[in-house]
Interface confidence: low
């Protein structure tokens, strides 16, 4: 069976002038997935991103995330790329108020 992921992009305050953007994929099966941040369509190097483990979510499916830190005001240049079981999609950073959340960094 194949269950496609739900992808959600969020943003949180990181430090003065910077935000952390996090791309979360959940509810997918099988567990093999590619998540990566892109700037102006070009993949960021892996050392500028942080990945969460692929973990079971208790429903027979899996979840994971990837995060990166970017300059506030440049959100429109960044997208999250997802590839799973032959399907792929890109997800922009949402506009709007920055949420103050616990950072992964």
């Amino acid at each position: 069976r194949t269950v496609p992921p739900m992808v959600n992009v969020t943003r949180s305050e990181a430090s003065e002038g910077n935000i952390t953007v996090t791309c979360r994929a959940s509810g997918f099966y099988p567990w093999n997935i590619t998540l990566s941040w892109r700037q102006d369509g070009v993949s960021l190097s892996h050392d500028t991103q942080q990945w969460g483990d692929v973990l079971p979510d208790g429903n027979g499916t899996y979840q994971t995330w990837v995060a990166t830190r970017i300059c506030q005001g440049e959100e429109q240049r960044f997208t999250c790329y997802m590839e799973h079981s032959g399907n792929h999609s890109t997800h922009p950073v949402p506009s709007g108020k920055v949420l103050v959340l616990q950072s992964h960094w």
Epitope: N32, T34, R38, H46, W51, E83, H84, H88
Partner: antibody, heavy 119, light 108 residues
Framework: QVQLQESGPGLVKPSETLSLTCTVS????????GHWIRQPPGKGLEWIGM???????DYNAAFISRVTISVDTSKNQFSLKLSSVTAADTAVYYC?????????????WGQGTLVTVSS | EIVLTQSPGTLSLSPGERATLSCTAS???????LHWYQQKPGQAPRLLIY???NLISGIPDRFSGSGSGTDFTLTISRLEPEDFAVYYC?????????FGQGTKLEIK
């Protein structure tokens, strides 16, 4: 049956452009990405770059000023162009498929084609 | 760049013996992005193990992988004649995405 086949000139003159094509079958380049890797005679493997399923590219910084990887999904082909070649670019060039979820690993490879740079 | 150093350079063993191949990274590599390939003379490499320890379908279970951080290991529990080849580790953790120099596994 998944197959990849490299093609192109076996001899390229110094300062010219090396052009290779990888023709794939058994899968679609709209759902799988592709890599180019090379191996100088008697030496190890060197990653050149890759093309993602939506056409974006990632390159090894060592080649970035002279490499272009492109895709023609209608022909199920992706291509490598390496400009301003020297004798140091003599190698067996491989194309490979980026496996789904294999964290950029290359799950199928072409048999390789030897390109010699010589005048 | 991350340099992958494989050891030993050449390993001479007999069929039936256990082979342990090492791959040491110059800086930490995520286990998700460390892969192993096998290459026989005149052939293209083939993927054996991805993400440190995941065996590719069709690869015999005498092959296994382990490790984390900077130290990774490929183990062949009981060597068969067809296992004698060159083995490469490969990291896709940081660009450029490098290979080790290879370990040649030869018949003693």
């Amino acid at each position: 049956q998944v197959q990849l086949q490299e093609s192109g000139p076996g001899l390229v003159k110094p300062s010219e452009t090396l052009s290779l094509t990888c023709t794939v079958s058994g899968f679609s380049l709209t759902t799988y990405g592709g890599h180019w890797i090379r191996q100088p005679p008697g030496k190890g493997l060197e990653w050149i770059g890759m093309i993602w399923t939506d056409g974006w590219t990632d390159y090894n910084a060592a080649f970035i000023s002279r490499v272009t990887i492109s895709v023609d999904t209608s022909k199920n082909q992706f291509s490598l162009k390496l400009s301003s070649v020297t004798a140091a670019d003599t190698a067996v060039y491989y194309c490979a498929r980026k496996g789904h979820g294999y964290y950029y690993a290359m799950d199928y490879w072409g048999q390789g084609t030897l390109v010699t740079v010589s005048s | 760049e991350i340099v992958l150093t494989q050891s030993p350079g050449t390993l001479s063993l007999s069929p039936g013996e256990r082979a342990t191949l090492s791959c040491t990274a110059s800086s930490s590599v995520s286990s998700s992005y460390l892969h192993w390939y096998q290459q026989k003379p005149g052939q293209a490499p083939r993927l054996l193990i991805y993400s440190t320890s995941n065996l590719i379908s069709g690869i015999p279970d005498r092959f296994s992988g382990s490790g984390s951080g900077t130290d990774f290991t490929l183990t062949i529990s009981r060597l068969e004649p067809e296992d004698f080849a060159v083995y490469y580790c490969h990291q896709y953790h940081r660009s450029p995405f490098t290979f080790g120099q290879g370990t040649k596994l030869e018949i003693k």
